[in-house]
């Protein structure tokens, strides 16, 4: 708290300008009118106010708007946004994408702070869903944003928004998140032809079921090993050697280097050794010839 002291003669601020950087904290408190500050917020960011001076300016706005700042002020907060607490931000009603962009710009190049996370949460909840323009904006500032959402939150992403997602936006997504995103991507890209479809869907395939992988194997897609290694193990296990060979195309040779890692290791254990031998890669660990394979899960379902 800054003590209430009278403004020295001749120091009353008539406008928000660079001369204010020479004001002490108590002078800013005494000589800057909160209403003037609110109407000239757009000037604050153009002036190199210190951390301590920004504290005083925030205090003035808090007194003027105890119930939360109006959007006209929020949009021009600039670096003053860094002084806000999540509690402050929860009082706001931010509806404009321009306001969101302006505030994200302030923290650009830095990790997502609790303030930014709260702001995004407020904004998205206010809109009711994560529309394409919002997702475009958020992933531009924070490529990992999508993967920071829970599967429940991701369920509110409309398929049309999937067009805004870039491969790097999914780098840190786990299988549970891809399980939610994959069906949306499939829907979003359904009208594309084979090769174009594969380019778009590739990043989402960590959520694809077996039947979709089987379908892709019939389309000469030449999936790379990096994508294959991110597939769900339970989706890969039922694939035959022939289907994996078609799915990977010339990349099938990469299986040898990955034979000790999931899902390749688990898939090898499910294949007949003589089928694996047809690949000519020296993959070992398949079911020996003459052995009978019992699918116990199927047996349980029948009993």
């Amino acid at each position: 708290e800054v003590e209430k002291t009278a403004c020295p003669s001749g120091k009353k601020a008539r406008e928000i300008d660079e001369s204010l950087i020479f004001y002490k904290k108590w002078e800013l408190e005494a000589c800057v009118d909160a209403a003037l500050l609110a109407t000239q917020m757009d000037r604050v960011n153009a002036i190199p106010f210190t951390y301590e001076q920004l504290d005083v300016l925030k205090h003035k706005l808090d007194e003027l708007y105890p119930q939360g700042y109006p959007e006209s002020v929020i949009q021009h907060l600039g670096y003053l946004f860094l002084k806000m607490s999540p509690e402050d931000i929860r009082k706001w009603n931010v509806t404009s994408l321009e306001t969101l962009k302006a505030l994200l710009e302030v923290n650009k190049g830095h990790e997502m702070s609790p303030q930014v996370a709260t702001l995004i949460d407020r904004f998205v909840k206010g809109r009711g869903q994560l529309d394409k323009d919002t997702l475009d904006t958020l992933t531009a500032f924070y490529p990992g944003y999508l993967c920071s959402l829970s599967p429940e939150e991701l369920s509110s992403v409309p398929p049309s928004s999937i067009w805004a997602v870039r491969p790097q936006d999914l780098d840190t997504c786990d299988p549970r998140q891809l399980d939610v995103l994959y069906p949306k991507a499939r829907l979003a890209f359904q009208n594309m032809n084979g090769s174009e479809y594969f380019v778009k869907i590739q990043s989402f395939l960590g959520g694809a079921p077996t039947e979709d992988l089987k379908a892709l194997s019939q389309q000469n897609v030449s999936m790379d090993l990096a994508t294959f290694m991110k597939l769900r193990t339970d989706a890969v296990l039922p694939l035959t050697v022939a289907e994996v060979q078609k799915l990977l195309g010339p990349h099938v040779e990469g299986l040898k280097a990955e034979e000790r890692h999931r899902p390749v290791r688990d898939w090898i254990l499910r294949q007949r050794q003589d089928d694996l031998d047809t690949l000519g890669l020296g993959l070992q660990g398949g079911i020996p010839n003459g052995y009978l394979v019992l699918d116990l899960s199927m047996q349980e379902a029948l009993s």
């Epitope: 960011n45 106010f49 210190t50 301590e52 860094l82 190049g109």
Partner: nanobody, 114 residues
């Protein structure tokens, strides 16, 4: 954000120095910036500032002697100090934008006029 000030040293009264401040990223090209100084036992105070629009302002004590400028291509801010006086002795810091708002400072560069 890293701020690296340089160019300080020992100089005789009436002499000149040119301080430089380099920042990581594109911090100075887009933001308002300022030079500050802190004399022994004193509070840090602003000396010269440049708004994001490019207008400059100086503390009364250095007006006419100091000049702030910036080179956006090099992401560097300068402080040309002429007609130096013993009372200009201090550690000089530059700052602006995100780091200034967050209260992060560089090491500063020491100027001694004697």
């Amino acid at each position: 954000v890293q701020l690296v000030e340089s160019g300080g040293g020992l100089v005789q009264p009436g002499g000149s120095l040119r301080l430089s401040c380099a920042a990581s990223g594109s911090m100075f090209s887009i933001n308002a910036v300022a030079w500050y100084r802190q004399a022994p036992g004193e509070q840090r105070e602003p000396v010269a500032a440049m708004t994001s629009g490019g207008s400059t302002i100086y503390a009364d004590s250095v007006k006419g002697r100091f000049t702030i400028s910036r080179d956006n291509a090099k992401n560097t801010v300068y402080l040309q100090m002429n007609s130096l006086k013993p009372e200009d002795t201090a550690v000089y810091y530059c700052n602006g934008g995100w780091s200034l708002a967050m209260g992060y400072w560089g090491q500063g560069t020491s100027v001694t006029v004697s």
